[in-house]
Interface confidence: low
């Protein structure tokens, strides 16, 4: 089965790439705008430049195109603990993160929210945090893994997971984390 | 098949150096953190040193710290740990370990390096 285009694919697709169909006369291709410019007027004929103007400030558009507006820019979450990492330019969206020592925890595709990355206080660092995960720690003995913090044992109830893991063990070496290391 | 292989061990004097390796296969190297344990003569296992993923936490046991350096070649699928001012009591079996992620220390050992530290 062939896959159903929509009108304005379909229309894209007679024309060379880099331009697209003029909607007004279907024998007519018009060269697409420059990312950062905007679709102002169609060209009025073959090898005729097309119309594109810069986008405005907070706006932008991020690839060639046939736009009759430019996009808004985003706006950092700052509910949701975002930073902006780079401001938005005529041909670039806002970047959005996190600050040092956090991680992005993705609520839906587009929103995330920043959390400290765990510290491992009584355990140690297995996988180091990540820009959207955070610290995996591993406790020392004595101590279980609740909410990616290490819990003392004395805090394990009977009916919880952890049971298992609080059974007396054999002494495990308790290392201190190098001071030279963050 | 998970294999680990020591290497670099040997016979040095007091107060030398030496750097152990472990060329490690069958997994995802930069997955999982590791680390190193011994066995001296007649005693009991030790741990030595462990070290995160990416490199970026180093563990020490109080009785290496400040002369053992664990590092990582994640490219090389390589664990190393550079030995200096080595002591009598350092003579042991070396041994790389790969951490589980869970509770439970490690779940694979390579087969050891010896080490001897004597004059």
């Known amino acids: 089965l062939v896959p159903h285009l929509g009108d304005r694919e379909k229309r894209d697709s007679v024309c060379p790439q880099g331009k697209y169909i003029h909607p007004q006369n279907n024998s007519i291709c018009c060269t697409k705008c420059h990312k950062g410019t905007y679709l102002y007027n169609d060209c009025p004929g073959p090898g005729q430049d097309t119309d594109c103007r810069e986008c405005e400030s907070g706006s932008f558009t991020a690839s060639e195109n046939h736009l009759r507006h430019c996009l808004s820019c985003s706006k950092c979450r700052k509910e949701m603990g975002q930073v902006e990492i780079s401001s938005c330019t005529v041909d670039r969206d806002t970047v959005c993160g996190c600050r040092k020592n956090q991680y992005r925890h993705y609520w839906s595709e587009n929103l995330f929210q920043c959390f400290n990355c765990s510290l491992c206080l009584n355990g140690t660092v297995h996988l180091s945090c990540q820009e959207k995960q955070n610290t995996v720690c591993t406790c020392h003995a004595g101590f279980f893994l609740r909410e990616n913090e290490c819990v003392s044992c004395s805090n394990c109830k009977k009916s919880l997971e952890c049971t298992k893991l609080c059974l007396p063990q054999i002494e495990n070496v308790k290392g201190t984390e190098d001071s030279g290391t963050t | 098949e998970v294999q680990l292989l020591e290497s670099g061990g040997g016979l040095v004097q007091p107060g030398g150096s030496l750097r152990l390796s472990c060329a490690a296969s069958g997994f995802t190297f930069v997955k999982y953190s590791m680390g190193w344990v011994r066995q001296a003569p007649g005693k009991g296992l030790e741990w030595v040193s462990q070290?995160?993923?990416?490199?970026?936490?180093?563990y020490y046991a109080d009785s290496v710290k400040g002369r053992f350096t664990i590092s990582r070649d994640n490219s090389k699928n390589t664990l190393y740990l550079q030995m200096n001012s080595l002591r009598a009591e350092d003579t042991a079996v070396y041994y790389c370990?790969?951490?589980?992620?869970?509770?439970?220390?490690?779940?694979?050992w390579g087969q050891g390096t010896l080490v001897t530290v004597s004059s």
């Open positions: 370990a790969k951490y589980t992620g869970r509770w439970e220390p490690f779940d694979y």
């Open positions: 070290i995160s993923n990416t490199g970026d936490h180093t």
